[in-house]
């Protein structure tokens, strides 16, 4: 398990002509928020799935009103990270969709209106536990700058968050920089060390000593940008101009744009113009609607009939987040007392109690009467570290909560019959005996063998 974190640095007009108008105006002040959708793998099949790795919605940004005559600036952003928890292994390769939404705060009937300003998508390699990766994506005339990383949540560790490192009863004595691991509890794990010099921004490793490059970078240490020139062989050294002897295949050859997208070459690569409902580098990603099932954990999807309209997930108890992807952290309320360890099993909370304490919330002190309530007038008796409830007549069980059968112990002597009574028991004695428990024989002359006073 772990968390994918996305930090938006700026959203504003991109470079070049055709700068967009500000999305907000004096008449219609607005604020931005962002949505991220994650899907595993790099394959187009995986890209067709809903946000299988999870999704998250940012907070709303500050309200912005356009200044008349001023160019559109970078727009004010919401505070904080977008966090997408993932429960299983981090896949290492993933697709992302980041949507920029505008919330108009005018006097709309029925509350604020939402509209999608921009949507960017990409496919990346990323090892969990690595440094922040920076990225710039353009959507039309807009430019989005952001960083992202995946980190494991304790006790998970490793590039895929599949190893567990959980100190059991107490901190480990592993050497400096090492940490104890379970289920291989009898070893100490060294932090992963990539090949010396491996670029922290563009490289990562899944095994010690290797250096694997993120998309767009190459070389043994991932420090060389991938060339985007379409030349197969350069001109000879005498040539004063750069160019190609033989034109190589162009980036749009074979049309890399899926789903009917049209390809146009750019100075560095190519760009796909996608038909409505598709987006991504190669138009391989379809818009997320309620039909895609974006609400996790049994959430109810409302609205969002077409890709450019928003949907809302109504989450069941125990879940939250824009896609019901976050389990409410019930352990944060610290329900386990006396140092107990809280475990959220989903269907229930469990407390694992420290020695000497017990009960659903570790509320009972096993060693003294203070932690034990004896019901129905019972009294707690302790001694030598042990304790028990001494129950009032007619009650039994560990806490005197059970109605005892007063006749179960056969209290009537000499064949007397026992009858349970609301206040205890009554013995009907056999002929020749008397007393509350039929313990005294009756002498033939009518006198009873009562003990002397």
């Amino acid at each position: 398990a772990g968390v994918f974190e996305l930090q938006i640095h700026s959203f504003g007009p991109g470079p070049g002509p055709g700068a967009p108008r500000s999305p907000c105006s004096a008449r219609l002040p607005c604020r931005l928020f962002f949505r991220v959708c994650l899907k595993p793998g790099l394959s187009e099949e995986a890209a067709e799935s809903p946000c299988a790795l999870g999704a998250a919605l940012s907070a709303r940004g500050p309200v912005y009103t356009e200044q008349p005559g001023a160019p559109a600036p970078d727009l004010p952003l919401p505070d904080g990270l977008l966090q997408v928890p993932f429960r299983d292994a981090w896949p290492g390769t993933f697709s992302f969709i980041i949507e920029t939404w505008r919330e108009e705060l005018g006097d709309q009937i029925g509350g604020p209106a939402w509209s999608l300003l921009a949507r960017v998508a990409g496919r990346r390699r990323l090892a969990a536990g690595g440094p922040w990766a920076r990225d710039i994506q353009r959507a039309g005339a807009w430019e989005l700058r952001f960083s992202y990383r995946a980190r494991c949540e304790p006790p998970a560790v490793g590039t895929a968050c599949t190893r567990l490192c959980r100190p059991r009863s107490a901190p480990s004595r592993c050497g400096p920089g090492l940490r104890p691991c379970a289920p291989l509890e009898d070893e100490c794990e060294a932090p992963l060390v990539c090949r010396a010099g491996c670029s922290p921004e563009h490289g990562f490793c899944e095994q010690p000593g290797e250096c694997r490059c993120l998309e767009g970078w190459t070389g043994p240490l991932c420090t060389v940008p991938v060339s985007t020139s379409s030349c197969l062989s350069p001109r000879g050294p005498s040539s004063a101009t750069t160019g190609c002897l033989v034109p190589g295949p162009g980036p749009c050859d074979g049309n890399p744009c899926a789903n009917g997208g049209s390809c146009s070459e750019t100075p560095r690569s190519f760009e796909c113009t996608c038909p409505r409902g598709f987006y991504g580098l190669r138009c391989e990603v379809s818009g997320v609607t309620c039909a895609d099932g974006p609400c996790f954990n049994g959430g109810l999807c409302v609205g969002g009939a077409d890709p450019d309209s928003a949907y809302i997930c109504h989450c069941p108890p125990g879940f939250q987040g824009s896609n019901c992807e976050k389990r409410v952290d019930r352990c944060s309320l610290q329900p386990c007392r006396n140092g107990g360890l809280c475990l959220d099993l989903g269907h229930a909370l469990r407390c694992r109690c420290r020695a000497g304490f017990a009960g659903p919330r570790c509320e009972h002190d096993l060693d003294d009467c203070a932690g034990r309530a004896c019901a129905n007038g019972g009294t707690c008796v302790e001694g030598g570290g042990a304790h028990r409830c001494s129950c009032a007549l007619g009650f039994g069980g560990r806490d005197c909560r059970e109605r005892a059968d007063p006749c179960a112990a056969r209290p009537c002597a000499h064949g007397g019959r026992c009858y349970a009574h609301f206040s205890g028991l009554v013995c009907a004695c056999a002929p020749g005996y008397m007393g509350a428990r039929c313990e005294f024989p009756v002498h033939p002359d009518g006198a009873s063998a009562l003990p002397a006073a």
Partner: antibody
Framework: EVQLVESGGGLVKPGGSLRLSCAAS????????MSWVRQAPGKGLEWVGR??????????DYAAPVKGRFTISRDDSKNTLYLQMNSLKTEDTAVYYC??????????WGQGTLVTVSS | DIQMTQSPSSLSASVGDRVTITCQAS??????LNWYQQKPGKAPKLLIY???NLETGVPSRFSGSGSGTDFTFTISSLQPEDIATYYC?????????FGGGTKVEIK
């Protein structure tokens, strides 16, 4: 790696004394309750006694058969648990295990040390 | 003292069989019960705590259930490495007491 290593076992005559030690490593010994459990040859497990952490009072509790004869103590500075056994009887013959009792269970066990009481 | 009565004292089963061991407490101990496995010549190992919770790293074929006075320990599909003696243990009250053990063998 949690390790508990018992030492001090051996052959002793009835009425004699023996002191067992348990060297602990791989966890914060001072925070942890510790116990001794024994197992007579071919028999089941029998709890001997326990000592709480100093932060929980450091008190001791014993099973009836050893009460008054055995004493459990700890030296947190040395990460060591002790079992002082006096007035030994033949029925005290057993493998003695040192155990960590952090949760309400014997979480980790040593390999055990054999104590033989025989004339 | 709380007496823990385990049954059977020994059993023989085939690989893949479902094996069930019972443990009965002489009084109500809620779910304050643990199960241990002891292989020949080795120290015991905690398998189940609080009657039904699997200890970290223990295979899921082991399970426990019960509350009050009657408890059950189950191996859903017996494996050769499960040859051992299994003990229940209560911690409701001092002295801490163990069941007499159940020796599991392969047919």
């Amino acid at each position: 790696e949690v390790q508990l290593v018992e030492s001090g076992g051996g052959l002793v005559k009835p009425g004699g004394s023996l002191r067992l030690s348990c060297a602990a490593s791989g966890f914060t010994f001072s925070n942890t309750w510790m116990s001794w459990v024994r197992q007579a040859p071919g028999k089941g497990l029998e709890w001997v006694g326990r000592i709480k952490s100093k932060s929980d009072g450091g008190t001791t509790d014993y099973a009836a058969p050893v009460k008054g004869r055995f004493t459990i103590s700890r030296d947190d500075s040395k990460n060591t648990l002790y079992l002082q056994m006096n007035s030994l009887k033949t029925e005290d013959t057993a493998v003695y295990y040192c155990t960590q009792y952090y949760w309400n269970s014997f979480d980790y066990w040593g390999q055990g040390t054999l104590v033989t009481v025989s004339s | 003292d709380i007496q823990m009565t385990q049954s059977p004292s020994s059993l023989s089963a085939s690989v893949g069989d479902r094996v069930t061991i019972t443990c009965q407490a002489s009084q109500d101990i809620s779910n304050y019960l643990n199960w241990y496995q002891q292989k020949p010549g080795k120290a015991p190992k905690l398998l189940i705590y609080d009657a039904s919770n699997l200890e970290t790293g223990v295979p899921s074929r082991f399970s426990g259930s019960g509350s009050g006075t009657d408890f059950t320990f189950t191996i859903s599909s017996l494996q050769p490495e499960d040859i051992a003696t299994y003990y229940c243990q209560q911690y409701d009250n001092l002295p801490l007491t163990f069941g007499g053990g159940t020796k599991v063998e392969i047919k």
